[in-house]
Interface confidence: low
């Protein structure tokens, strides 16, 4: 038997483990907490709607919650959606959360609330209090928290959330909670670190606020401090993407030489945007376990050339001295310090944003000795020439990232390498990286309403490139040409992105044959001309292949265009040319004994697969060892007669989504012996097989979402013992019978999707009603999303709640 | 074919020195972290001892129960690596092993993809 | 140091049996945990690393897995020649430290 009500609109899931009952009612557009909530619930998520209060009776009964995040219930007006504003805060009544004796963490963020709620039991370990309107802290209303780990009082007072007040925090307020590790108060427009703090801190995060000035005494006794985020306090405003005020007369945040003295056990220290001009090394002298320090978005060009600083950080892992480059200064080359070479334990540096004309080997000598180091990022530096050579010193190293930049080839076969004759004027050189938010975010840790743990931020790295091995990211950049020598020294490389540039030559096997051990190459988004059969064969362990928005050649009329080019690359795994508008080939057939995998996605098998036209149903037919074909986005409004034959022997899975189909052909599958999963889903299909196992004895996954099927036909799953997923959803469906569904296949549906169709709730589905209501299938959004379209009374009402008594309920046969 | 081989255990009374060798083929020696690992009767494996590779200098590191009685070299021109022990005791008994470190582009992984068939050490009166 | 801990010291199996052989650590070791097959008057053979990935040569029937404290080897389909000591080893943090062994028997 069920442990709770199907009626109940959350997800209900058991983590073993950690003897966890999890309900989570997240984005359920729910107005009052639902009932038929499991009694044992641990952890219980509210998040996203619009509950308008809590009271005692709110979690009444519910005496093992250990967890209640019950954010954005009325996030403050300029945060939160413009067409559901909330305009009544949350009220929080007294005693609502004190009998739950082992509650541990609470969220409440995005609630407008005023003040710190009181009432809170004693075995509370957590709070989170962001994005309200809490913008005076006292004493007083941190009494009860003396337990509490982890507090989070940050977006009460900024740009977003604005309070229009100074932010306030008592003397001492902190003080007396003798268990806090951990406290955020970013983005509040603070104007002091607050003093005296707790000597159990561990994590301390005062990013963006408005203080000018560290004292020496700020950090006295934080003698456990492991992460300090001091970031954007006197931020550096060049090219900010949100409103940006800095330090009076542009200056850098002030830190006392001695500030620093009692981190001892500092990791993680965070200096981004604070217009720093010099780094002492005095603030380091006590923090040789320094593993993460983040400089970007500074003052530091001349500093990176110094850096002496560099000779206390034995420890470091990580170094960011991004976007530190003087406004209105087009370098020659990059200056690195000596001090580099120091940093024995270096694994990631990253200097984007220094902005120099070319890269020479001996700009990068400091490093050459970095035995751990595994990232160096010398993204969006608008470098113009760079031989590639030099990296035959950094075979050790698991990223080049040379992204966005202004490389482009040589005008002959010297040593120069890649080289470039744009135009220099410096208005061109201000870094234009707002599509790829990371150091121009304003909080890049900020938590979105879904997720309680902090966005993480990405950097550009392919990580699927990225895992075979040693890569090289050229992406972005202005290379119209590649030959061989361009790579010459770097056959250790196992991952070469090209994406993005303006590569147009007919490639014959061998512009890219110094790369004998590359594994994945990206050359998406340039100008492929595949005029030679023998183009990327040089590549003999290539793996991986993406050729994809190469449209350019294959839009015009009377190109060869040799699409058996993976004839020759003998280990070929994956291929992906999505969205090349492919409709013309000059080769009827693709060959590979190695390819599982083609992503056709967005090209013109219509106009290949014209109606008449049999030469190109064969198409795919010769990859043999094909099990994923992708021809999705291929405006397939039918399928000839032939396509199925034309298949490949082992394909597993088939997409066939987004095309526009009306029909098809389900008998025809019965060619595919051993199809496992097909994808119809966003098509226009409006009938289902007579009998899917009549069509398919393989088939485990069937998608059909997104279509205009308005019922299903009688037979419709009968036998068909080997369907482990079934999505339905988002059709016109509105009668399923009992025939339709034999019970002895649902029962081995691991997922059944059914959500936004049209069900008739009339007698007729009185079977319907009561299967739903008891079976153990998963049927996700059952109780919200899986409604009734009439008649009548029963208009908008959820499937599981129907009352069908007074129909004559027979459920014999 | 990547081989490890120990010599130089026996029978060594408390208070005695030994010094064991690994002799290595089939790598490049100095590329790697090399390491002992011991193992006493009836008792847990037990990393004793480190020697880095040419990229780290080749420098050392110990486990507390040997830090200042034992001493891990190596002969980068024989492609041998020793460990010699000083100040032995009873509970040093242990069949000890050589192994190689499984090596991440040069970065030390602390775990071992190469073991020698190991070699007996028995400290007794 | 971090101590490795295996609870059970024998498990007994039959071939074709699905077994697991469990390595609790005494701190976090984020994934960095080895596991190593010792037969009988043989020297230790590296099996899994990093909690979940295969040495190169190793049978698909060997499958790590775990996270935090918690750490498994599991072997889908026991064969004769799996009799052995197996430990778990955790490379997270210097020392490299051992679980104490759990010696798998073949009914």
């Known amino acids: 038997a069920r442990w709770f009500p199907k009626t109940l609109p959350c997800d209900v899931t058991l983590d073993v483990p950690k003897n966890h009952v999890i309900v989570d009612c997240t984005d359920k557009h729910l107005t009052e907490i639902p009932g038929g909530i499991p009694t044992n619930t641990t952890n219980l998520t509210l998040t996203i709607n619009h509950i308008p209060d809590i009271s005692p009776a709110s979690f009444h009964r519910l005496d093992h919650l250990v967890e209640i995040d019950f954010r954005c219930n009325c996030v403050p007006i300029p945060l939160g959606s413009k067409n559901n504003m909330c305009i009544k805060r949350l009220q929080i009544k007294p005693r609502s959360f004190s009998g739950l004796t082992y509650l541990k963490s609470l969220y409440l963020d995005g609630n407008q609330l005023l003040e710190i709620p009181q009432g809170l039991p004693p075995s509370l370990q957590l709070l989170s209090l962001e994005a309200n309107n809490i913008f005076s802290i006292r004493k007083e209303n941190l009494t009860e928290l003396a337990n509490i780990e982890i507090l989070y009082l940050g977006q009460n007072c900024y740009y977003r959330n604005p309070c229009y007040v100074s932010y306030s925090i008592e003397k001492d307020a902190f003080l007396n909670l003798t268990k806090l590790k951990v406290l955020s108060l970013k983005d509040n427009n603070v104007t002091a670190v607050p003093t005296v703090l707790p000597s159990t801190l561990t994590e301390l995060y005062l990013y963006n606020n408005m203080i000018a000035k560290i004292q020496e005494d700020d950090f006295n006794n934080l003698n456990q401090l492991q992460i300090l985020d001091l970031s954007g306090n006197c931020p550096r405003c060049y090219n900010a993407p949100f409103p940006c005020a800095p330090c009076k007369n542009n200056s850098p945040l002030q830190i006392h030489d001695n500030a620093f003295n009692s981190l001892t056990e500092l990791k993680v220290l965070r200096l981004h945007s604070n217009s720093l001009q010099h780094v002492p090394p005095t603030w380091f002298k006590n923090m040789n376990k320094l593993q993460e320090l983040d400089l970007s978005q500074n003052f530091l060009a001349k500093e990176i050339g110094d850096a002496k600083f560099l000779h206390f950080l034995p420890s470091l892992i990580q170094l960011d001295l991004s976007f530190n480059f003087e406004l209105q200064v087009y370098r020659a080359s990059m200056n690195l310090s000596q001090a580099f070479s120091s940093l024995k334990s270096l694994k990631i540096l990253r200097i984007r944003g220094y902005v120099f004309k070319e890269l020479k080997s001996f700009n990068l000598s400091p490093l050459h000795n970095l035995q751990n180091l595994e990232v160096l990022d010398l993204g969006t530096n608008f470098i113009k020439i760079a031989n590639l050579s030099m990296f035959k010193q950094f075979k050790r190293l698991k990223v080049i990232d040379l992204s966005v930049n202004k490389i482009s080839p040589s005008g002959d076969s010297s040593e120069v390498g890649f080289c470039s004759n744009a135009r220099t004027s410096v208005e061109s050189y201000e870094p234009q990286v707002l599509e790829q938010l990371h150091y121009f975010r304003y909080d890049k840790y900020a938590r979105s309403c879904r997720f309680k743990n902090k966005e993480a931020s990405f950097m550009s790295v392919n990580e699927s490139c990225y895992k075979y091995g040693q890569t090289l990211d050229l992406s972005k950049n202005s290379i119209f040409f590649v030959k061989s020598s361009d790579f010459q020294h770097l056959s250790f490389l196992k991952c070469l992105n090209l994406s993005g540039n303006l590569i147009s030559q007919t490639l014959n096997g061998s512009e890219f044959q110094p790369l004998a051990e590359l594994r994945y190459l990206d050359f998406s988004n340039n100008r492929l001309d595949l005029l030679h059969s023998t183009a990327f064969e040089e590549l003999h362990k290539l793996e991986v292949l993406d050729i994809s928005s190469n449209s350019h050649y294959f839009q015009s009329e009377g190109i060869t265009h040799m699409l058996n080019f993976t004839k020759n690359l003998k280990v070929l795994q994956k291929l992906m040319m999505n969205d090349n508008d492919i409709s013309s080939s000059t080769s009827r057939t693709m060959e590979s004994e190695s390819l599982r995998t083609l992503e056709f996605r967005g090209n013109h098998l219509d106009v290949l697969w014209r109606e008449g036209d049999n030469r190109y149903l064969q198409l795919f037919k010769n990859l043999l060892k094909l099990e994923e074909l992708d021809i999705s986005k291929n405006s397939l409004s039918f399928l000839p007669s032939g396509v199925f034959d034309g298949m490949p022997p082992n394909l597993k899975n088939l997409s066939l989504a987004k095309n526009g189909l009306k029909s098809f052909s389900w008998k025809k599958l019965q060619c595919l012996k051993n199809l496992e999963t097909l994808d119809l889903s966003h098509n226009q299909l409006t009938t289902v097989p007579e009998r899917l196992s009549n069509c398919s004895r393989s088939l485990k996954n069937l998608i059909l979402k997104n279509n205009q099927i308005r019922s299903l036909t009688k037979y419709f799953l009968q036998d068909a013992f080997q369907l482990r997923y079934l999505d339905l959803s988002s059709n016109k469906i509105q009668m399923i019978q009992k025939t339709s569904f034999p019970e002895n296949v649902l029962n081995n549906l691991k997922m059944l999707l059914l959500h936004h169709n049209r069900f008739l709730c009339t007698c007729d589905a009185v079977w319907f009603v009561w299967w739903v209501n008891h079976t153990e299938v998963t049927i996700p959004y059952l109780a919200t999303d899986v409604t009734c379209v009439g008649p009548g009374a029963h208009k908008g009402q959820s499937v599981i709640s129907l009352d069908l008594y007074t129909c004559e309920l027979d459920l014999t046969n | 074919e990547v081989k490890l081989v120990e010599s130089g255990g026996g029978l060594v009374q408390p208070g005695g020195s030994l010094r064991l060798s690994c002799t290595t083929s089939?790598?490049?020696?100095?590329?790697?972290?090399m390491e002992w690992v011991r193992q006493p009767p009836g008792k847990r494996l037990e990393w004793i001892a480190a020697?880095?590779?040419?990229?780290?200098?080749?420098?050392?590191e110990y486990s507390a129960s040997v830090k200042g009685r034992f001493i891990v070299s190596r002969d980068t021109s024989q492609n041998i690596l020793y460990l010699q022990m000083n100040a032995l005791r009873a509970e040093d008994t242990a069949i000890y092993y050589c192994?190689?470190?499984?090596?991440?582009?040069?970065?030390?992984?602390?775990?071992?993809?190469?073991w020698g068939a190991g070699t007996t050490v028995t400290v007794s009166s | 140091d971090i101590v490795m801990t295996q609870s059970h010291k024998f498990m007994s199996t039959s071939v074709g049996d699905r077994v697991s052989i469990t390595c609790k650590a005494s701190?976090?070791?984020?994934?960095?945990v080895a596991w190593y097959q010792q037969k009988p008057g043989q020297s230790p053979k590296l099996l899994i690393y990093?909690?979940?990935t295969r040495h190169t040569g190793v049978p698909d029937r060997f499958t790590g897995s775990g996270s935090g404290t918690d750490y498994t080897l599991t072997i889908s389909s026991v064969q004769a020649e799996d009799l052995a000591l197996y430990y778990c080893?955790?490379?997270?943090?210097?020392?490299?430290?051992f679980g104490g062994g759990t010696k798998l028997e073949i009914k």
């Open positions: 192994a190689r470190d499984a090596d991440y582009y040069g970065s030390s992984t602390w775990y071992f993809d190469v």
């Open positions: 089939g790598f490049t020696f100095s590329d790697f972290y």
């Open positions: 020697s880095r590779n040419k990229r780290n200098d080749h420098t050392t």
């Open positions: 701190q976090d070791v984020r994934t960095a």
């Open positions: 990093w909690a979940s």
């Open positions: 080893q955790q490379h997270y943090n210097t020392p490299p430290t």
